[in-house]
């Protein structure tokens, strides 16, 4: 499965859309910065078989989709940009699912690393908790937008390593 050919352009478009989504100056939100504990080790890609790496990427995109699909999110971001964002995420999820299906039977290892999936879920739980504690304020959403952009950039590095593995 040649993932990056179908996927990396969509990833770049997703980052571009997120960059346009900002509604307020991030400079006014400096004191709202927060340590979400991004699970860097899950995106290093060294300990993974390809199928497991794909499942981690899939979980991150699915959780991002869930996060930005809430009514609180819809009330914060521009509707047109959100729709474009959903479209790109949906495309990436489809690409990854197709890839996972192709990996079935190719490797002896399990398709999913359950611990890694749980780690990614807990990371997004921390993000959701932060938003709740901050009452979904504009600055809280700005901080989360910056965090998700960073996590997408870091996941792009994992995709690049996957491409080189082929």
């Amino acid at each position: 499965c040649d993932l990056p050919q179908t996927h990396s352009l969509s990833n770049r478009r997703t980052l571009m859309i997120m960059a346009q989504m900002g509604r307020i100056s991030p400079f006014s939100c400096l004191k709202d910065r927060h340590d979400f504990g991004f699970p860097q080790e899950e995106f290093d890609g060294n300990q993974f078989q390809k199928a497991q790496a794909i499942s981690v990427l899939h979980e991150m995109i699915q959780q991002t989709f869930n996060l930005f699909s809430t009514k609180d999110s819809s009330a914060t971001w521009d509707e047109t940009l959100l729709d474009k964002f959903y479209t790109e995420l949906y495309q990436q999820l489809n690409d990854l699912e197709a890839c996972m299906m192709q990996e079935v039977g190719v490797e002896d290892t399990p398709l999913m690393n359950v611990d890694s999936i749980l780690t990614v879920r807990k990371y997004f739980q921390r993000i959701t908790l932060y938003l709740t504690e901050k009452k979904y304020s504009p600055c809280a959403w700005e901080v989360v937008r910056a965090e998700i952009m960073r996590s997408f950039s870091l996941s792009a590095n994992l995709q690049e390593r996957l491409r080189r593995k082929e």
Epitope: L30, R33, A146, E147, R150
Partner: antibody, heavy 121, light 107 residues
Framework: EVQLVQSGAEVKKPGESLKISCKGS????????IGWVRQMPGKGLEWMGI????????RYSPSFQGQVTISADKSISTAYLQWSSLKASDTAMYYC??????????????WGQGTLVTVSS | DIQMTQSPSSLSASVGDRVTITCRAS??????LNWYQQKPGKAPKLLIY???SLQSGVPSRFSGSGSGTDFTLTISSLQPEDFATYYC?????????FGQGTKVEIK
């Protein structure tokens, strides 16, 4: 390798204009803010202002507001600091440094080598 | 503006000494404090960020602690290359502000 490379030393006369630069490489230039810091001879560090190269949004220290202009050209990964009318008191070393914005990551983790500006009649 | 006050402004110490520099903020800044080292003619170098996180590549003899208004930089065993000026800087809110610096000299 992440690098911030600043333009060379400048010698100017009072009243002249000047624009110094800071070119980023080895990372996504628009993913980090660029801050400017002044150090007058024998003195400490003073934060001047900062720019988000993704949209050129800026924030200045009140001490430097109206005295300097910070700008950026993301197409060439370069930030600028400029004066329209220099004063002798602007004589200093000027540093640029990158900042992670709203991300929980090290602040000002990479610095330029500095640009020495000398203003003398 | 948040004022940052470092103490002492200078100190003399010997190689192997334990050195402590303090930094006080004029209001609570949570853990949003960084420490930098600067040698003559060189750009500052980040040592510690968010009060206690050691920057990549910095020797473990450097450590930071504190939160709120009071912070400390400790060098557990001073080395010859550690003689320099040290600055704290708050990154809690704009305008960002630095301490006035602490010069560590050879006794």
């Amino acid at each position: 390798e992440v690098q911030l490379v600043q333009s060379g030393a400048e010698v100017k006369k009072p009243g002249e204009s000047l624009k110094i630069s800071c070119k980023g490489s080895g990372y996504s230039f628009t993913s980090y803010w660029i801050g400017w810091v002044r150090q007058m001879p024998g003195k400490g560090l003073e934060w001047m202002g900062i720019i988000d190269p993704s949209d050129s949004d800026t924030r200045y220290s009140p001490s430097f507001q109206g005295q300097v202009t910070i700008s950026a050209d993301k197409s060439i990964s370069t930030a600028y600091l400029q004066w329209s009318s220099l004063k002798a008191s602007d004589t200093a070393m000027y540093y640029c440094a990158r900042h992670p914005g709203l991300n929980w990551a090290p602040d000002f983790d990479y610095w330029g080598q500095g640009t020495l500006v000398t203003v003398s009649s | 503006d948040i004022q940052m006050t470092q103490s002492p402004s200078s100190l003399s110490a010997s190689v192997g000494d334990r050195v402590t520099i303090t930094c006080r903020a004029s209001q609570s800044i949570d853990r949003a404090l960084n420490w930098y080292q600067q040698k003559p003619g060189k750009a500052p170098k980040l040592l510690i960020y968010f009060a206690s996180s050691l920057q990549s590549g910095v020797p473990s003899r450097f450590s930071g602690s504190g939160s709120g208004t009071d912070f400390t930089l400790t060098i557990s065993s001073l080395q010859p290359e550690d003689f320099a000026t040290y600055y704290c800087q708050q990154s809690f809110d704009f305008p960002l502000t630095f301490g006035q610096g602490t010069k560590v000299e050879i006794k």
